[in-house]
């Protein structure tokens, strides 16, 4: 299929050759001539510099499973639709789609071949890691919770007696031994009571009483001795 | 296993416009090309369009002056709106995902069946 | 479009004998994209064969597709109860996607 082009132009003058830069369409290959280049076409195109082409669906130039669409027809161009994983006219370039960079936010792309599949990091999910599940907006912390943000991470402050990722669970006041000096802790309706050993008191049992009687409190309330249950609101 | 499910309107007057919507249960809706088929009743199977992610469309050409394919990553879902329906429009609407290796059809959602009448 | 025209309509068979089924189309079906699929009463069709001969996933190897360019056959070596459904072939080599109009194995 090879096209002698003329030359039209002082193509042949002392500038650069006439195969410089490739004026050959779809793959064709440059040849110099004595008057000018020509190009050999690959099949299917054809013209002076191969920019026709003669293809149609029937030929079947869509590879690695591409469906050919449209090119009914000599005179009429095809496309073809390539599936994941490939690209170029005729679906024949396979597709690195990690170097896209799909994945959002720091999420980590693999390539599976005829799938691609984003991992992402924690606080993150999605198809392509696009939902930030770490941000408060919308977000709701049970039970009177209140969201906090920080460092690209949420979590929920719970109200009292109440803890978990979202202040759903119910906590054991007690758990975290709040009662000082010995004082055994008794979880309650609202919260927490310490009854506290011989010799302290206060509402953790963290105020020695002193031997003459007094406490280290400014004053004690009314009604309270010491070793009485403490209740902590 | 990815799974597919069809909802929409079972009953459909003439002249209105088909909306039917294709859930998909995991989050491969960008890994793959999506598709509509349908079946007349005790008919053979014929395909009505397919979409990609990339927003890649193709339409049957009998069709294609009344159909809209759409797709919305954010929800897993993929969906078909046939307008200015008739009774030759009656059928169990399927959706499917394109296979990997070529425009055939690997998974299939179980189909939801369409009447056309006033 | 490439029309696909799927004989016979209807083959009566036993279980355990062999099924031949054709497909054949009006042109060229380029690069052998050629599927078949099974469809039971009331469900959705499954894809059996790719690419003309390739299994799909998980079916068995008692059935086998053969052919290119314009004339196909899937077999079933040896039928069993559960083989008794229509099949469709389905061409993806140009667009618009076609179907056979099906073939339906019945137990005789």
């Known amino acids: 299929y090879p096209y002698d082009v003329p030359d039209y132009a002082g193509m042949l003058g002392s500038g650069p050759g006439p195969c410089d830069g490739n004026p050959c369409a779809n793959g064709g290959s440059c040849s110099e001539t004595p008057r000018s280049f020509e190009c050999t076409c690959p099949r299917g195109f054809y013209g002076l510099r191969c920019e026709v082409s003669g293809v149609t669906c029937a030929d079947g130039p869509c590879f690695n499973g591409g469906l050919c669409v449209g090119g009914a027809d000599p005179d009429s161009a095809y496309i073809c639709h390539c599936p994941p994983g490939f690209q170029g006219s005729n679906c024949e370039k396979r597709v690195d789609r990690c170097s896209l960079q799909p994945c959002r936010n720091g999420g980590l792309c693999l390539d599976l071949g005829h799938a691609l599949r984003c991992r992402c990091r924690a606080g993150f999910a999605g198809p392509r890691c696009e939902h930030d599940l770490d941000d408060c907006a919308g977000r709701a912390c049970a039970n009177g919770g209140t969201c906090v943000e920080g460092g690209g991470a949420h979590r929920c402050s719970c109200a009292l007696g109440f803890g978990g990722r979202d202040c759903r669970e119910r906590a054991d006041p007690c758990a975290a031994r709040p009662c000082a000096h010995g004082g055994r802790c008794y979880a309650h309706f609202s919260g927490l009571v310490c009854a506290c050993a011989p010799g302290y008191m206060g509402a953790r049992c963290e105020f020695p009483v002193h031997p003459d009687g007094a406490s280290a409190l400014p004053a004690a309330p009314p009604g309270l001795r010491p070793g009485d249950p403490q209740r902590y609101l | 296993q990815v799974q597919l499910q069809e909802s929409g309107p079972g009953l459909v007057k003439p002249s209105e416009t088909l909306s039917l919507t294709c859930t998909v249960s995991?989050?491969?809706?960008?890994?793959?090309?999506w598709s509509w088929i349908r079946q007349p009743p005790g008919k053979g199977l014929e395909w009505i369009a397919y979409?990609?992610?990339?927003?890649?469309?193709n339409y049957n050409p009998s069709l294609k002056s009344r159909v809209t394919i759409s797709l919305d990553t954010s929800k897993n879902q993929f969906s078909l709106q046939l307008s200015s329906v008739t009774a030759a429009d009656a059928a169990v609407y399927y959706c499917?995902?394109?296979?990997?290796?070529?425009?055939?059809?690997?998974?299939w959602g179980q189909g939801t069946m369409v009447t056309v009448s006033s | 479009e490439i029309v696909l025209t799927q004989s016979p309509g209807t083959l009566s068979l036993s279980p355990g004998e062999r099924a031949t089924l054709s497909c054949r189309a009006s042109?060229?079906?380029?690069?052998?994209?050629l599927a078949w699929y099974q469809q039971n009463p009331g469900q959705a069709p499954r894809l059996l064969i790719y690419?003309?001969?390739s299994r799909a996933t998980g079916i068995p190897d008692r059935f086998s597709g053969s052919g290119s360019g314009t004339d196909f056959t899937l077999t079933i070596s040896r039928l069993e109860p559960e083989d008794f459904a229509v099949y469709y072939c389905?061409?993806?080599?140009?667009?618009?996607?076609?179907f056979g109009g099906g073939t339906k194995v019945e137990i005789k």
């Open positions: 389905q061409q993806y080599g140009t667009s618009p996607l076609t």
């Open positions: 995991d989050n491969s809706i960008s890994n793959y090309y």
């Open positions: 690419g003309a001969s």
């Open positions: 979409i990609y992610y990339s927003g890649t469309t």
């Open positions: 042109q060229r079906v380029s690069n052998t994209y």
């Open positions: 499917a995902r394109v296979f990997h290796w070529g425009f055939a059809f690997d998974i």
